[in-house]
């Protein structure tokens, strides 16, 4: 069944994507694109990393985790209804046809009108510590820990299961990882 990630208009949305570098600082290029992953490359690129740094990003799209440790999860700032749709995380693993690609479906809901502040129950609110610092250098926020190594199908599935705040709260101190190399 299709998995959805949800956020409300005006909030930040979070789309998880992780890998484990083969060695510290031995990074793999990653691109994020709007729209389903094409078979080659990324289309409609909103953010791209190379072997060392974030080398391209567009307004409102950024990485808040420590991408040098393989947390390449995408944050979209101050979302609108137009941000709904499929996003592609492509991990460009070196070698012939080794790329791993994941489609993540983002659904933006109209903002709730509530008379008094209540605890938010959407996906983004489950990750407040990951949404507090903007920057493209080493993340100033605490990074996710690691679960035991799992295969790429499992990471996609596990990442998909982070879609509601209950699961997100349960898993907020863990993270699915892909080990490269």
């Amino acid at each position: 069944s299709e998995v959805e990630y949800r956020a409300e208009v005006g909030q930040n949305a979070y789309l998880p994507c992780f890998y484990t570098p083969a060695a510290p600082g031995n990074l793999v290029p990653v691109c994020w694109g709007k729209g389903a992953c094409p078979v080659f490359e990324c289309g409609n690129v909103v953010l791209r990393t190379d072997e060392r740094d974030v080398n391209y990003w567009t307004s409102r799209y950024w990485l808040n985790g420590d991408f040098r440790k393989g947390d390449v999860s995408l944050t979209i700032e101050n979302v609108t209804l137009a941000d709904s749709g499929i996003y592609c995380c492509r991990i460009q693993i070196p070698g012939i046809m080794n790329d791993e690609k994941f489609n993540l479906k983002l659904v933006i809901k109209p903002a709730k009108v509530t008379p008094a502040p209540t605890r938010q129950r959407d996906f983004t609110a489950a990750f407040p510590r990951m949404l507090t610092t903007r920057g493209h250098g080493p993340a100033e926020t605490q990074t996710l820990g690691s679960l035991p190594d799992i295969n790429l199908t499992q990471i996609s599935t596990l990442a998909n299961e982070l879609r509601d705040s209950r699961l997100a709260n349960d898993l907020r101190d863990s993270g699915a990882t892909i080990r490269i190399g």
Partner: antibody
């Protein structure tokens, strides 16, 4: 407008190397990928290789050992070499554009070039 | 490699008739987000192929809406609702999720 055109020899001897050129206009090779697909007479299509917009290369594993693809972005040309030719390599060779989105995969094609490999 | 099996290999239709072509894959062409990487191309006689349908059910640019695609997983169908004379040619399905990309053997549509 977008155009792709294949050029190269129409007849090649077996065991020789086939060198094909795809010259494109109406778009930049740094924004779009260009792939090669062939069609033996009366048969179906077979994907050969692609040079992506970012310069990455992907090959059909069944042909990989005999293939080389590269490009000259300044001349808007993509080149395909097929070596150690067999008569089964006789086909119409198409170059085609990959727009790097799912809705533009092979959205424009060249007219095709018929290549005969003789023994 | 992914094997795509197209049926029938040849199809005869009269103008205005509705026809369907089947494409079956040896592996699933859908991912966990429900995206299905199946494409349909039409190759008219003596011409290059042209994109008809992408992602199983989306109409390519400038393609008449008498063409429609459906299916997910491993079973797919292309339907032409009311065949026109310009529809004759060979229809190819292609999968775009696994490298190498592979095509079906083609279905030739003839006009009676």
């Amino acid at each position: 407008q977008v155009q792709l055109k294949e050029s190269g020899p129409g007849l090649v001897q077996s065991s020789q190397t086939l060198s094909l050129t795809c010259t494109v206009s109406g778009f930049s090779l740094t924004n779009y990928g260009v792939g090669w697909i062939r069609q033996p007479p009366g048969k179906g299509l077979e994907w050969i290789a692609i040079m992506t917009s970012g310069g990455s290369t992907y090959y059909n594993s069944a042909l990989r050992a005999r293939l080389n693809i590269n490009r000259d972005t300044s001349k808007s040309q993509v080149f395909l070499e097929v070596n150690s030719l067999h008569t089964e390599d006789t086909a119409t060779y198409f170059c085609t554009r990959d727009g790097t989105t799912v809705e533009t995969l092979f959205d424009y094609w060249g007219q095709g070039l018929m290549v005969t490999v003789s023994s | 490699d992914v094997v795509l099996t197209q049926t029938p290999s040849t199809l005869s239709a009269i103008i205005g008739q509705s026809v369907s072509i089947s494409c079956r894959s040896s592996q699933s062409l859908s991912d966990s987000a429900g995206i299905t990487y199946l494409y349909w191309y039409l190759q008219r006689p003596g011409q290059s192929p042209q994109l008809l349908i992408y992602l199983a059910s989306n109409l390519g640019s400038g393609v008449p809406n008498r063409f429609s695609g459906s299916g997910s997983g491993t079973d797919f169908t292309l339907k032409i609702s009311g065949v026109e004379p310009e529809d004759l040619g060979v229809y190819h399905c292609m999968q775009g999720i696994h490298v190498p990309l592979t095509f079906g053997s083609g279905t030739k549509l003839e006009i009676k």
